[in-house]
Structures are given as structure tokens and as C-alpha cells.
Interface confidence: medium
Amino acid sequence: DEGKASSAKQRLKCASLQKFGERAFKAWAVARLSQRFPKAEFAEVSKLVTDLTKVHTECCHGDLLECADDRADLAKYICENQDSISSKLKECCEKPLLEKSHCIAEVENDEMPADLPSLAADFVESKDVCKNYAEAKDVFLGMFLYEYARRHPDYSVVLLLRLAKTYETTLEKCCAAADPHECYAKVFDEFKP
């Protein structure tokens, strides 16, 4: 039964990757991994997302050898760097190779770090929001998604992606306005459930 569920999940991921494309898959992965590994830094999560996307692309294209190799490499990397990723990986990383990847994929969310600062300072109040967004849009939006997701393990990934999309749309509109800050100052109010 567990094997069937895992296989169904994989088929769903392949369908999503094919239908929505790599950028959307990466956004989904940033949100999910940030919830699962809230103590990991953004650069670490981004590396995992890049590697995970490569694994899924190969698996979905039927490149089964590359898929298996890269999946094993990713599990190895995660286990070698578990101190900077999550405190919940110990048991998974002690399992034999074939069980390791599946265990990591199902691992519970780590505890959120204490005293995470408010997001408003960097994503609303900073005078450089539009400059930062223009400089590296996907990285800035990725950071926003990471920071929001790690603070909200209770939110669905779909909701997190919707919030990130709202933020992106707001910046696209407001950064072209006469007074950008005035325009996006209330963006977080739109996020209230």
C-alpha cells in the first residue's frame, strides 16, 4: 500500500511538472522544503530544490538510471549535511540506501527556529524592495516564499504559492508606480485569512 501511494505521488509530481513547468515545480519545492526544514538557510534549501528538480525531471522522462543515481546522491548529500538541514533526519539516514530516499521524502517537519524576525522589514518596509526585486526577481521571490513558508508549517503549499503570487503581482504593479512604497505598504494585509 505504501508503495502504491508513493507511486501515485510520483505520477502526480510528473503530471504537475509537465503541465505547469519547472519554475512552478521549483516554487512548490521551495515552499514544501522550507516548511519541512525551517532551520536550513535559504541557500541550502535552494540547492536542495535545484537537485530535487533534476531528480524529478529525470525520473519523469524515464531516465531511470540517472534518476536512481541522482536520488541516491541527493539522499547522501542531505545525510552528510543534516546538521545544517534538519534535526529530524537521523533515523532516515541510518536506513539502508533503498529506504533512505523514501524516508527523507516523508520526514516530519523540523521545529521552527525561535525568534524569527518579522518579514515586513525586508519585504515591505525596506526602501530597497523594488531594487532588490528588479535585480534578481526569482531569487527575491524565492526568498519571500522560503521565509513565509518556514514560518507557516500550518499553511498548505497551494496557499503559500498563492500568497507569493499575490506578492509578485503587487510588486510588478507597485514598482512601476509613482510611489512604490505607498502602493505595496499594505500588501501583507491581503494575506490575512
Epitope: 538557510e41 535559504f42 541557500a43 535552494s46 540547492k47 524576525p117 522589514a121 525586508d122 525596506s126 526602501k127 530597497d128 531594487k131 532588490n132 528588479a134 535585480e135 534578481a136 531569487v139 527575491f140 524565492g142 526568498m143 521565509e147
Partner: nanobody, 128 residues
Framework: QLQVVESGGGLVQAGGSLRLSCAAS????????MGWFRQAPEKEREFVAG?????????DYADSVEGRFTISRDNAKNTAYLQMNNLKPEDTAVYYC????????????????????WGHGTQVTVSS
């Protein structure tokens, strides 16, 4: 692991110039502040200069290098630079590049603890 690699060190006469480069292996590093530190023999590692990665590029310098050293970055190349002019013998040290893990708006810190990713260093020797 995520890599940070310095280059450009060497031997130079007092009054001369050098330009150090710091290449980061991941595009995501454009999101982080970055700093240069140095360590002379028998001395503690010390802050030299820092820059925020994003546009706005807040910069910060140690008093001992202000006006002589300039930190800059090229996001397209994932690279930061330290232009060192009017070098003095007391600038002799191993120079380390480090990437912070602060949020993008954060100023580049002077505290070593706010930097997660470090290079192995490049030697700068200034002869009199």
C-alpha cells in the same frame, strides 16, 4: 557544499594595488550580504569590508582601510571584488571572503558569526 572561492592575492610593493575576487557557486548568493575578512600571522581574524548583495549595495569598511579599499559586486557573475590601493605592509594577511545568511535588506555585518559560508583564503603580502 556551497562553495566560495577567493583569488587575486599575491606579493606587491608598498603603495601598490591588488584586486581580489570572490566567486560564489550558487545564483542564490545574490540574496546575501558578503564580507572580506583578513588574518595576519599571530592575530585574530578581522573584518575588512562588507556589501549587501542586492541593488542598493550598502557598503561598510573597517577604519583601517576606509578610503584605500573598495568593495563591489557583479551579480551577473556571482562575484564580489575587493580593490586594494595604496597598500601598506600592515595589510599583509590571508584574506577571506564570506557570505552571510542574513535577509536581503540586512546590512553586511562585521561579526564573523553572521557569516555562514567561507572561502579558504588568498595570501596578500605587502613588502616595504
Amino acid at each position: 557544499q556551497l562553495q566560495v572561492v577567493e583569488s587575486g592575492g599575491g606579493l606587491v610593493q608598498a603603495g601598490g594595488s591588488l584586486r581580489l575576487s570572490c566567486a560564489a557557486s550558487e545564483r542564490t548568493f545574490v540574496a546575501y550580504p558578503m564580507g572580506w575578512f583578513r588574518q595576519a600571522p599571530e592575530k585574530e581574524r578581522e573584518f575588512v569590508a562588507g556589501i549587501s548583495w542586492f541593488a542598493g549595495a550598502t557598503t561598510d569598511y573597517a577604519d583601517s582601510v576606509e578610503g584605500r579599499f573598495t568593495i563591489s559586486r557583479d551579480n551577473a557573475k556571482n562575484t564580489a571584488y575587493l580593490q586594494m590601493n595604496n597598500l601598506k605592509p600592515e595589510d599583509t594577511a590571508v584574506y577571506y571572503c564570506a557570505i552571510s545568511h542574513q535577509l536581503p535588506g540586512g546590512r553586511p555585518g562585521r561579526d564573523m558569526d553572521s557569516y555562514s559560508y567561507w572561502g579558504h583564503g588568498t595570501q596578500v603580502t605587502v613588502s616595504s
